[in-house]
Interface confidence: low
């Protein structure tokens, strides 16, 4: 129903705490360079205004849209042009163009320093002094670095953060309590960020229909006992929620997500037998839990898929009468039978099925033409299965760091023009798939591996879009979302690349590397590895291993030396010479 005041409606629905958190996230995602204090001031002003509208919905400006209210606030910020350049031009536009303009200026790779975690004692002190401000800083810092982070889910992670601090700050050894728990939250939040970015990319590039297809496949896998009408309803609602969040309508998004969670919990009998434990939780935990609930037990009596989609004499008639519905039922029926497939694979199969019907239903004898369609799925299924087997075998042999290095070499050879920091970030993220997925039971590996890789490669595409340098990457990123991963996997050494000349300073290191945390040391070594491959794209694995082992030995020796500086300055040039010789 229509409300006289949209802002009063959302404030009432969400409550003050969530309302303020979501407005802070929205502002931080739009204006990524502003300080916490600047944004906190705006949030307070918006909240005070919302309260006046709650008291009197007819008060001045209470009838304005949220985009108008928020946009006016952002455009009133002093020094907007100096700090944000052409983003300030958005303020010359009217809604809805102004909001679209803000969205287009969101930066997926803002030049902000990494979010460093303070040491335990300092963190606990500031948390105890003012928990609200502390959590506000967390929301602000994450949101500005991840401008498409799923806002209601970020509130969930903030709640987790809060609970961990409350528990650990009361302990004697705060550090050892906090570190593993906060690392766990950080890892989950980063994965959540790339997954959500993928959903927004799908929505932005291919529209709601593409996202809805993704949702139908995913929901059908999770809720195989729900009927098609139920799955369609859930997919439609989920599409609306994601469209709102991707579009910056965070209050509506969070409100609608809460409604969807409520609906699911009120309709468990027709959706899934696995929802009860989620539904017993408070709102943020409930919605999070529902989003990753385990798959329901598959119905025992499902007939073979061929009956309705290959053997039925009416296939072409049914397809012609309502293409989207017929393809939707195919995707639903196939997905509920295959929780062991990735959503990307299921969408490729549905696309293949659609292409087959398009071709065959125009022929003289359609059944003879489409009769082999299920057999034609085989190579599409085998390809990702082989990918999982090969990569998980390699991960088990090399461990995470070694596996990342293998991927780094592979991807630097595929796209040597891409900047080294981007290649290192991508390889480190892609390499984590081993730890994340290869330890899972066999039937969960494929969906985990492929859908995670697709999300990481989406980030590669987004970063590459800003400064396109590789034709290989452009080719893979231009196609459909579900074809990206197979496209990247199929890339080989870029023969058009002219190798980089050898620069000694690229491989020159100093004693400061010795005191870096392990992760930073790894990144330094991986940076050197990518540069080596750019210098010698056709170097063999054996040659690269020799050089990297020598490099590791050099670091180990010099970091243990009494006079580290002298060791680095004398042994460093020798290492560079040996590297050149090994790769000659």
């Amino acid at each position: 129903e229509a409300h006289k005041s949209e802002i009063a409606h959302r404030y009432n629905d969400l409550g003050e705490q969530h309302f303020k958190g979501l407005v802070l996230i929205a502002f931080s995602q739009y204006l990524q360079k502003c300080s916490y204090d600047e944004h906190a001031k705006l949030v307070q002003e918006v909240t005070d205004f919302a309260k006046t509208c709650v008291a009197d919905e007819s008060a001045a400006n209470c009838d304005k849209s949220l985009h108008t209210l928020f946009g006016d606030k952002l455009c009133a910020i002093p020094n907007l042009r100096e700090n944000y350049g052409e983003l300030a031009d958005c303020c010359t536009k009217q809604e809805p163009e102004r909001n679209e303009c803000f969205l287009q200026h969101k930066d997926d790779n803002p030049s902000l320093p990494p979010f460093e975690r303070p040491e335990a004692e300092a963190m606990c002190t500031s948390f105890k002094e003012n928990p609200t401000t502390f959590m506000g800083h967390y929301l602000h810092e994450v949101a500005r670095r991840h401008p498409y982070f799923y806002a209601p889910e970020l509130l969930y992670y903030a709640e987790q953060y809060n609970e961990i601090l409350t528990q650990c700050c009361a302990e004697a050894d705060k550090e050892s309590c906090l570190t593993p728990k906060l690392d766990g939250v950080k890892e989950k939040a980063l994965v959540s960020s790339v997954r959500q970015r993928m959903k927004c990319s799908s929505m932005q590039k291919f529209g709601e229909r593409a996202f809805k297809a993704w949702a139908v496949a995913r929901l059908s896998q999770t809720f195989p006992n729900a009927d098609f009408a139920e799955i369609t309803k859930l997919a439609t609602d989920l599409t609306k929620v994601n469209k709102e969040c991707c579009h910056g309508d965070l209050l509506e998004c969070a409100d609608d997500r809460a409604e969807l969670a409520k609906y699911m919990c009120e309709n468990q009998a027709t959706i899934s037998s696995k929802l009860q434990t989620c539904c017993d939780k408070p709102l943020l935990k409930k919605a999070h839990c529902l989003s990753e609930v385990e798959h329901d037990t598959m119905p025992a009596d499902l007939p073979a898929i061929a009956a309705d989609f290959v053997e039925d004499q009416e296939v072409c008639k049914n397809y012609a009468e309502a293409k989207d519905v017929f393809l939707g039922t195919f995707l639903y029926e196939y997905s509920r039978r295959h929780p062991d497939y990735s959503v990307s694979l299921l969408l490729r199969l549905a696309k293949k099925y659609e292409a087959t019907l398009e071709k065959c239903c125009a022929e003289a004898n359609p059944p003879a033409c489409y009769g082999t369609v299920l057999a034609e799925f085989q190579p599409l299924v085998e390809e990702p299965k082989n990918l999982v087997k090969t990569n998980c075998d390699l991960y088990e042999k090399l461990g995470e760091y070694g596996f990342q290095n293998a991927i780094l070499v592979r991807y630097t050879q595929k796209a040597p023009q891409v900047s080294t920091p981007t290649l290192v970030e991508a390889a480190r993220n892609l390499g984590r798939v081993g730890t994340k997925c290869c330890t899972l039971p066999e039937d969960q590996r494929l969906p985990c591996v492929e859908d995670y890789l697709s999300a990481i490669l989406n980030r590669v595409c987004l970063l590459h879009e800003k400064t396109p340098v590789s034709e290989h990457v452009t080719k893979c990123c231009s196609g459909s979302l579900v074809e990206r991963r197979p496209c990247f996997s199929a890339l080989t050494v870029d023969e058009t690349y002219v190798p980089k000349e050898f620069k000694a300073e690229t491989f020159t290191f100093h004693s400061d590397i010795c005191t870096l945390p392990e992760k930073e040391k790894q990144i330094k070594k991986q940076t050197a590895l990518a540069e080596l491959v750019k210098h010698k794209p056709k170097a063999t694995a054996e040659q690269l291993k020799t050089v990297m082992d020598d490099f590791a030995q050099f670091l180990d020796t010099c970091c243990k030396a009494a006079d580290k500086d002298t060791c680095f300055s004398t042994e460093g040039p020798n290492l560079v010479t040996r590297c050149k010789d090994a790769l000659a």
């Epitope: 006992n225 009927d227 119905p299 025992a300 009596d301």
Partner: nanobody, 115 residues
Framework: QVQLQESGGGLVQPGGSLRLSCAAS????????MSWVRQAPGKGPEWVSA????????RYAESVKGRFTISRDNAKSTLYLQMNSLKPEDTAVYYC????????GSQGTQVTVSS
């Protein structure tokens, strides 16, 4: 082999009652949500009611709410549908199904409401 066998249908006057049963075998009955679906002559299948695996959560189509009650006995692997205040428009073949599915894997039981 999954088998669902409905019984309890028959001819009843408007306002009367019937209790349908569905005996299940060939699968772990207690692990699955179950539904009743009906099909009137010349019409498509219509979902009537569903119950979750434990029997705690039940759902009904608007047309039968307040008149029909779904229940189950997991020890006996049997699903029930108690139908009160029956109306002529309840006339149909009633099927039990696994999950909330309208695909029918059984013969069904005929319910006719007529004076």
């Amino acid at each position: 082999q999954v088998q669902l066998q409905e019984s309890g249908g028959g001819l009843v006057q408007p306002g009367g009652s019937l209790r349908l049963s569905c005996a299940a075998s060939g699968f772990t009955f207690g692990s699955f949500g179950m539904s009743w679906v009906r099909q009137a002559p010349g019409k498509g299948p219509e979902w009537v009611s569903a119950i979750d695996s434990g029997g705690a959560d039940t759902r009904y189509a608007e047309s039968v709410k307040g008149r029909f009650t779904i229940s189950r006995d997991n020890a006996k692997s049997t699903l029930y549908l108690q139908m009160n205040s029956l109306k002529p428009e309840d006339t149909a073949v009633y099927y039990c199904t696994i999950g909330r599915s309208s695909s029918r894997g059984s013969q069904g039981t005929q319910v006719t409401v007529s004076s």
